[in-house]
């Protein structure tokens, strides 16, 4: 297992609709054809997996149908979008990149992006 540098923004504020996008960029030492990207959430020293996708270079990222993540890839960059976020989901979202094929296997873990989320103000009651 070889180490690889992964860069991501330190802080992102989610939109009022609970959507946050950020780029996860990895310094690929070779010509990987199969890449796995995992998003981990760290909150109060607990780490949980948010979503993961494996993709072939040049193809779209495919997350599970019920995943809250979507993404696109371009070269050594992965543009990740997490939706359905609420205030309670505020936390550090860490990008983990694995170069699966061809060997050697490389692993890189970013420092994390702190995503701040605020619940939208409830709409005032209307008479309609």
């Amino acid at each position: 297992c070889k180490a690889m540098h992964v860069a991501q923004p330190a802080v992102v504020l989610a939109s009022s609709r609970g959507i946050a996008s950020f780029v996860c960029e990895y310094a690929s030492p070779g010509k990987a054809t199969e890449v796995r990207v995992t998003v981990l959430r760290q909150a109060d020293s607990q780490v949980t997996e948010v979503c993961a996708a494996t993709y072939m270079m040049g193809n779209e990222l495919t997350f599970l149908d019920d995943s809250i993540c979507t993404g696109t890839s371009s070269g050594n960059q992965v543009n990740l979008t997490i939706q359905g976020l609420r205030a309670m989901d505020t936390g550090l979202y860490i990008c983990k990149v694995e170069l699966m094929y061809p060997p050697p296997y490389y692993l890189g873990i970013g420092n994390g992006t702190q995503i701040y989320v605020i619940d939208p103000e409830p709409c005032p009651d209307s008479d309609f």
């Epitope: 330190a10 992102v12 504020l13 939109s15 505020t90 701040y116």
Partner: antibody
């Protein structure tokens, strides 16, 4: 090293607007946010809101909603805070501060805004 | 919004004495509590982040502890240059908030 340099002092009349700038250096501007905090004479620190330089999204404290606008110019690594319909109780030192994972870490030197007729 | 309360409001201390300042949050904020020092006519400076982690360049006499709702800033062996107002700040949820401050002066 991280530096935030703010624009100079302002004297404004009630009802006017003020726009304070904050030029950042020493780090990747778009990786962080810029928050704005004010401090009235002899008082504590009051959080006004912040902007994510990464995507331009903003979060304002309800008290200032509709009266404040925070923007960034990523080409010059500069953040701006505009406060409208100024009142005498808006007289304060206005600070910009970098927002990181651990809240606010680095601060500008402050800009004194005096509202007086 | 999360309300932070600090105690005491004011403390007059002799040099080399130990100072303890507490900050209480109105709800659980985990460890997302940070401490700042502000000297007269200066900008605030970060001392402690995430309740107990010293910020770079901060003297070792400053330390922090706590989690959840109760937090403490300790200055071991106070020095004359530590005369300042100390603020706690939470980044657990938006909007961010500050405590009202604790003024420390030297006897």
């Amino acid at each position: 090293q991280v530096q935030l340099v703010q624009s100079g002092p302002e004297v404004k009349k009630p009802g006017a607007s003020v726009k304070v700038s904050c030029k950042a250096s020493g780090y990747t501007f778009t990786s962080y946010g810029i928050g704005w905090v004010r401090q009235a004479p002899g008082q504590g620190l009051e959080w006004m809101g912040w902007i994510s330089a990464y995507n331009g999204n903003t979060n304002y404290v309800q008290k200032f909603q509709g009266r404040v606008t925070m923007t960034t110019d990523t080409s010059t690594s500069t953040a701006y805070m505009e406060l409208r319909s100024l009142r005498s109780d808006d007289t304060a030192v206005y600070y910009c501060a970098r927002v990181g994972a651990s809240g606010v870490d680095y601060w500008g030197q402050g800009t004194l805004v005096t509202v007086s007729s | 919004e999360i309300v932070l309360t600090q105690s005491p409001d004011f403390q007059s201390v002799t040099p080399k004495e130990k100072v303890t300042i507490t900050c209480r949050a109105s709800q659980n904020i985990g460890s997302s509590l940070h401490w700042y020092q502000q000297k007269p006519d200066q900008s605030p400076k970060l001392l402690i982040k995430y309740a107990s982690q010293s910020f770079s360049g901060v003297p070792s006499r400053f330390s922090g502890s706590g989690s959840g709702t109760d937090f403490t800033l300790t200055i071991n062996s106070l020095e004359a240059e530590d005369a300042a107002t100390y603020y706690c700040h939470q980044s657990s949820s938006l909007p961010f908030t500050f405590g009202p401050g604790t003024k420390v002066d030297i006897k």
